[in-house]
């Protein structure tokens, strides 16, 4: 709709087409136009602010009738609102409804609400915090609306007393006097940025601030920038020599994505390194997943993500991103024994050699050690050169001979992607050379001594064959595209679920390929594409619906923010900014485009999993039908409680992870099993988290178990966006055996917490696996 996220909007009642507005405190329907008395805006703390009346929409649940009214934005009434698809709910899950032209709040309403001039729900463009600098608030975000001289301000204000647009960081400026200069998106690098032509970047040095890593990341993102990534020794020198820079500050380096290594939040490759030997990338159990830089030494230090620090944002001078077409299929001819793939030929050499010898051998084959430049290349390695269950380590062409570390490809190509394994790249201090291998199972990279003897992959250019009208082995009719052993075709008619076909998505690689197919729909009206994912039994558990009505378990998930949001739906992929992200839609009324898929071979077998009758190691416990063994670390057996990261690393040190669940019944049984373990009430960390910025606010399990159920209750937390780790509540209740998974108002037992909260925890290991000691 061309509207910016924080722009005012009208609220349209989908069923009547009328707009709502307040009249002397009450909500009524009126004909829609964009007159100011119908304009609303999302403000801080999930509140809806009405521009004309300068009040917030709220619920007075103290009255016998739950009265929907406008309240002063500093009122104690319930002023928060959240979306569930196109409905809007507030306290006690009362939903906004329109009856006889009057706004009201009732628990069983099914009214549809949209933003004026679009098909978007009111939450499709949520409120984005505007962080601050200077002033006296240490970078805290603006509080909108804020009160000055009896007027509520819903945006930053400009006056002669301040150096730029400013805001208050508490509700009542007159009382608290807390303020800061607003950090809003700006074209170019004028007000809050320093331009550096040499590095083609603008830098924003936020020195008088104290934000967590995630807050700093969000602050940069909300300005169309990112936390600082450092890509060369020259850039490091520029930063070290910068006057007035904070002594220690956050950079974009993190390993917040479960089971992945260190990466820059702007997705630049991490091949230049400058770790502090005292705070390295591969820390002990007490280690951390975020990195700060010491401005004096230029060294990077892993540090607790919850610490409050200054930060540096960076944005490119010009935003032209050249998209190389890495996913397009091209038929390729190679010598016998070599694997052809999209213009290149690959050879996995099964003899073990040091890196240098492997490199020499590849050269002798008129090739080089493999260089990997995209996820499409990683996919080749994982799916074509190895059986996915093979856990062998294999040399690639990445090597470092420099101090500070700079990894480069032996074939001279530019490093455009890095794909590090957990706690990698872990480079020994002041020791070179350093070489890189990958693990066949996932293709993730690891730094090794170059003398290690490993298998290796050689790569060379192949002969591209002439393009045909359709990709080889795909149906001859127009529009089929090949990816691996599968063909895909987009059908552009918008239809209800299941009309054309049921698409399954089984891996990150397939998802990336599909994202590439859907990218051309970015600029048009926001389109959706059906997948075959559905909750047939309306119990909150999603499975792939495949041919013949067979259900197939989810092996990979890619949910959007706050998804899966409701039971009984069908799943579509969005396009635009969050391309490929999964959202639950109504199976009958919602219409979307389709992507159909034809396998050239049969559907692969389901992955072999542990058996319920496998035994548990000593000291670990389980319950009937469970495929896992559990070890509970609660107050009666531990010296201290731990934050989420400490708990997860503790479990990893045992060869385990914080516990995860795939099925509704599993968590019910698990909780029942736990209630018998100890008395009293306990909050226990589990593996569920949304710490990684890549997740865009969706949840993931720390052991890579895909999310297939509605897990997180949709209860309100003011600071939900920074409650990134989940815990379960367990208490002994001998009188109750029944549990409700996703929708229990009486007893919500799963809740997001700030990740630095100290809690007890539960580790989980698959049955049949021996823990580390």
């Amino acid at each position: 709709s061309g509207r910016a996220a924080n722009d005012p909007f009208t609220i349209v009642h989908g069923n009547t087409g009328k707009c709502i507005k307040p009249v002397y405190g009450w909500i009524v329907a009126d004909d829609c136009d964009e007159t100011e008395d119908k304009l609303w805006k999302w403000v801080s703390q999930h509140r809806l602010f009405h521009l004309h009346s300068q009040k917030c929409l709220g619920l007075d649940i103290t009255k016998s009738v739950n009265e929907l009214r406008m309240f002063s934005c500093d009122s104690s009434a319930m002023l928060w609102w959240k979306c569930e698809h196109h409905s809007l709910y507030g306290a006690a899950r009362y939903r906004l409804a329109l009856k006889d032209g009057h706004g009201t709040a009732i628990s069983n309403a099914s009214d549809v609400w949209k933003k004026g001039g679009s098909e978007e729900s009111l939450c499709d463009q949520p409120y984005h915090e505007i962080y601050t600098r200077d002033g006296n608030s240490y970078g805290r975000p603006c509080e909108f609306p804020f009160l000055i001289d009896g007027t509520w301000h819903h945006d930053c204000i400009l006056d002669e007393d301040h150096s730029g647009p400013w805001c208050a960081t508490t509700l009542n400026y007159e009382y608290d006097r807390k303020w800061g200069i607003c950090l809003k998106p700006e074209n170019g690098c004028e007000d809050n940025w320093e331009k550096n032509e040499q590095f083609g970047s603008c830098y924003q040095f936020n020195t008088q601030t104290a934000l967590s890593w995630k807050e700093a990341y969000v602050s940069c993102q909300n300005q169309g920038a990112d936390l600082l990534s450092i890509n060369s020794a020259a850039e490091l020198t520029y930063l070290k020599e910068k006057e007035g820079i904070a002594k220690i500050f956050w950079i974009g380096l993190n390993q917040l994505y479960s089971a992945r290594g260190w990466e820059w939040s702007d997705h630049k490759p991490l091949n230049f390194l400058n770790w502090d030997p005292d705070r390295p990338s591969a820390p002990t159990i007490g280690g951390s997943s975020c990195a700060r830089m010491d401005a004096e030494s230029g060294l990077w230090q892993s540090f607790s993500c919850e610490a409050q620090l200054p930060y540096v944002c960076r944005k490119p001078l010009n935003n032209t991103v050249e998209l190389t077409d890495v996913w397009t299929y091209s038929d390729t001819r190679c010598d016998a024994g070599w694997l052809p793939n999209n213009g290149f030929c690959y050879l996995l050499v099964n003899e073990s050699n040091s890196w240098d010898k492997a490199h020499a051998k590849c050269k002798a084959f008129s090739s080089d050690l493999i260089s990997i430049h995209s996820l499409a290349d990683v996919e080749v390695v994982v799916t074509k050169l190895h059986n996915e269950d093979i856990k062998e380590e294999v040399w690639i062409g990445l090597k470092n001979i420099n101090i500070p570390t700079l990894f480069q490809w032996s074939d001279g190509t530019e490093v455009t992607l890095t794909y590090w394994d957990e706690n990698e790249p872990n480079v020994p201090y002041n020791k070179t050379p350093n070489c890189v291998s990958y693990l066949g199972e996932l293709g993730q990279w690891k730094v090794q001594s170059c003398e290690e003897k490993l298998k290796y992959v050689c790569k060379r250019k192949g002969e591209k064959l002439n393009d045909a009208s359709s990709d080889k082995m795909c149906p001859p009719d127009e529009g089929w595209k090949r990816h691996g052993e599968t063909c895909y075709k987009i059908y552009e008619d918008e239809v209800p679920f299941g009309t054309n076909c049921n698409l399954t998505i089984t891996s990150r690689f397939e998802q990336e390929y599909l994202n590439d197919l859907m990218k051309k729909y970015d600029k048009s009206l926001r389109k959706y594409f059906w997948t075959g994912l559905r909750d047939v039994d309306s119990c909150g558990e999603y499975n792939w619906a495949t041919v013949g009505g067979r259900r197939r378990a989810v092996t990979f998930s890619n949910w959007n923010f706050l998804e899966p949001a409701s039971p009984g739906g069908c799943v579509a992929m969005s396009t635009g900014k969050s391309v490929g992200k999964w959202e639950v839609k109504d199976c009958r009324s919602f219409k979307a485009l389709s992507i159909c898929k034809k396998m050239s071979g049969p559907l692969g077998p389901e992955e072999a999993s542990p058996k319920p009758d496998d035994p548990c190691p000593e000291g670990w416990q389980s319950f009937p039908a469970s495929l896992s063994c559990y070890k509970v670390f609660h107050a009666e057996r531990i010296v201290r409680k731990r934050n989420w990261e400490e708990a997860e690393r503790f479990c990893q040190a045992l060869g385990a992870h914080l516990s995860s669940f795939s099925h509704v019944d599993e968590i019910k049984e698990f909780l029942h099993f736990l209630t018998d373990q100890f008395s009293g009430q306990h909050w226990l960390w589990i593996g569920l988290n949304k710490r990684s910025p890549d997740l865009q606010g969706s949840w993931q399990w720390s052991d890579r178990t895909p999310v297939s159920t509605i897990i997180m209750p949709n209860e309100f937390q003011q600071d939900y966006d920074i409650r990134d780790c989940a815990a379960v509540k367990v208490f002994h209740r001998p009188w109750r055996r029944g549990w409700h998974f996703y929708d229990d108002r009486e007893f919500i037992y799963l809740r997001p917490f700030a990740c630095d909260t100290k809690l007890e925890w539960v580790c989980q290991i698959p049955k049949g696996r021996t823990p580390k000691t």
Epitope: Y24, G25, W26, D37, H52, V65, G101, H102
Partner: antibody, heavy 118, light 109 residues
């Protein structure tokens, strides 16, 4: 044509209570909001309060909280105002007026004269 | 509590333009005060003219218009007529209650 018909003049003794009415005709009663105003002799208007006939919700001028009580009877499309503990200060003409979604007072009653005298 | 102030009296001639204003003791009048203008003619005949600062009630002649001028609400009669002679009250909405001004007596000579 919308009309607001108010009850007739009242004479009461100090300390008593009175309940006056304002009957709406010619429109959907619950589509609008009903205001009550007081005009003492030779003085300006004072706003007493507003009631939402749809749900019975009210807002009062702080000065009249405890003095006036606004109610509605949807079945007869009538709004009521009860005034209690009357004194001579309460002697005035009382008006009802309605507004719709455009904020203005589009229709007014003819007024009810209240005299409080011993 | 806020006090709403109006001119006590204004005199104009037929065909002339006259502007009545409404000031708030708490600061500038804004759209969130939903300024209303009410006309009182002899025999307690009240008519609502303007609501929500600038919405004219049905049947009210177009010569009546509402606006904000500076920090005040205003009612402008463009081309006054003899039948416009009346008392005009302004009412401002503060924290879920209206407060009326004392009224402006307009004479059209």
């Amino acid at each position: 044509e919308v009309q607001l018909q108010q009850s007739g003049p009242v004479l009461v003794k100090p300390g008593a209570s009175v309940k006056m009415s304002c009957k709406a005709s010619g429109n959907t009663f619950t589509d609008s909001f009903m205001h009550w105003m007081k005009q003492s002799h030779g003085k300006s208007l004072e706003w007493i309060g507003i009631i939402n006939p749809y749900n019975g919700g009210t807002s009062y001028n702080q000065k009249f909280k405890g003095k006036a009580t606004l109610t509605v009877d949807k079945s007869s499309s009538t709004a009521y105002m009860e005034l209690n503990s009357l004194t001579s200060e309460d002697s005035a003409v009382y008006y009802c007026a309605r507004n719709g979604v455009r904020y203005y007072f589009d229709y007014w009653g003819q007024g009810t004269t209240l005299t409080v005298s011993s | 509590q806020a006090v709403v102030t109006q001119e006590s009296a204004l005199t104009t001639s037929p065909g002339e333009t006259v502007t009545l204003t409404c000031r708030s003791s708490t600061g500038a009048v804004t759209i969130s005060n939903y300024a209303n203008w009410v006309q009182e003619k002899p025999d307690h005949l009240f008519t609502g003219l303007i609501g929500g600062t600038n919405n004219r009630a049905p049947g009210v002649p177009a010569r009546f218009s509402g606006s904000l001028i500076g920090d005040k609400a205003a009612l402008t009669i463009t081309g006054a007529q003899t039948e416009d002679e009346a008392i005009y009250f302004c009412a401002l909405w503060y924290n879920n209650q209206f407060i009326f001004g004392s009224g402006t007596k307009v004479t059209v000579l």
